[in-house]
């Protein structure tokens, strides 16, 4: 994300197209309080960060509320008055969508439809991962709206589900971040469970009539 200028590595995360976090790793300045200066218009004076992130007592990043215009951030990381890293970035390329909200499950026999609130911007993928204790790894299904139907489930098995949002790479590029996962929820026979047993429960013997 950031070529090293004077050994400074930067990382940008644009949370939900609302808040931007710029962090830096500067081995040369590891015991120094570098300052962060920014602007959202190319011709304005720089403002200084008012919400620093600290690591081991020293500044390591800045959290900003973005001006939602053209999403260009101009910034300068300084040691006193000396700039050690100056750049501009189109923040959208570093999008991290917010975690899915209002996740709901609608069961119908051997299928479940998982829905949540769509985010206010587009070109996203809503991914549902699920597994039962019988599965060695998570299964996955994704759609471009938060309305994902998974079929072929075994009504007798307990399934764990979680959901996340990803930015489409052909729109946002390769440097975005998936959202955090939603909380895991467990379901069996269309009812919510506290957890799925870690080991598969043996099937109950059928009583002959």
């Amino acid at each position: 994300q950031g070529g090293a200028a004077e050994g400074v590595q930067i990382q940008i995360i644009y949370f939900n197209l609302e808040t931007v976090q710029v962090t830096w790793n500067a081995s040369k300045y590891s015991r120094t309080n570098l300052t962060f200066h920014y602007r959202f218009n190319g011709d304005e004076a720089y403002d200084q960060c008012t919400n620093y992130l600290l690591q081991e007592g020293h500044t390591s990043g800045c959290l900003l509320d973005a001006e939602q215009r053209d999403d260009i951030l101009y910034f300068s990381i300084r040691n006193g008055t000396h700039p050690v890293f100056t750049a501009s970035r189109w923040m959208v390329y570093y999008l991290k969508p917010s975690s899915p909200k209002h996740v709901r499950f609608s069961w119908h026999q051997d299928a479940v439809t998982v829905t949540c609130s769509d985010l206010s911007y587009g070109d996203l993928l809503y991914e549902v991962q699920y597994r039962s204790p019988f599965d060695t790894e998570w299964q996955s299904k994704q759609e471009n709206t938060c309305n994902v139907t998974i079929e072929g489930l075994d009504a007798e098995k307990c399934y764990s589900f979680w959901v996340r949002v990803k930015a489409m790479e052909d729109v946002y590029g390769p440097d975005t971040y998936p959202s955090d996962w939603s909380e895991v929820t467990c379901w069996q026979r269309g009812e919510i469970r506290d957890a799925c047993a870690e080991t598969p429960t043996p099937p109950k013997p059928k009583l002959s009539k």
Partner: antibody, heavy 121, light 107 residues
Amino acid sequence: QVQLKQSGPGLVQPSQSLSITCTVSGFSLTIYGLHWVRQSPGKGLEWLGVIWRGGSTDYNAAFMSRLRITKDNSKSQVFFKMDSLQADDTAIYYCAKPYYDYDGNWYFDVWGAGTTVTVSS
Amino acid sequence: DIVMTQSQKFMSTSVGDRVSVTCKASQNVGTNVAWYQKKSGQSPKPLIYSASSHCSEVPDRFTGSGSGTDFTLTINNVQSEDLAEYFCQQYNRYPLTFGTGTKLEVR
């Protein structure tokens, strides 16, 4: 692929309003702003205004009092309305989409075909 | 507003020649300049941005240079299809402003 389709009248009476719709496909108005530019005979290209992805607008001060840009994200449409047209507003009106590189440098990569507007009685 | 001046309204050249179109900004715009080609009856087509970066699918005979207030679009090995009007544009400050245009005539 990215396309901007413009629809609007060709002839406008003096003192009347001009309304143009720009319908976009291949990208989302929730990510990109949309700009409006015109070319008047003998006047070159003139930037009129923009509606940003969040819905806020910036206008060229010369047109601020009579220009309004709105949009409907769900229909992928942007609406341009200019009031009180006079003969010197005769021009080709374009909507245009920006492309940004990683460093925040940009240009208008896709333009509508243009709406030719003549102001005359 | 920043004024972008293209002092030459018309330029004449021959196929195979090299031609330079110039643009002067009324104040420092860094490298925040783009160039567009406009053919009659068509929409503008981007050629160069950030003063010297190529827009996608633009032949490399088009090159841009300059920073601050003075900018140049150079067309090497001019082709007949380069008959068009060329505009510079600054995006350093709103309102965005364009140059007055230079019409290229290919003999």
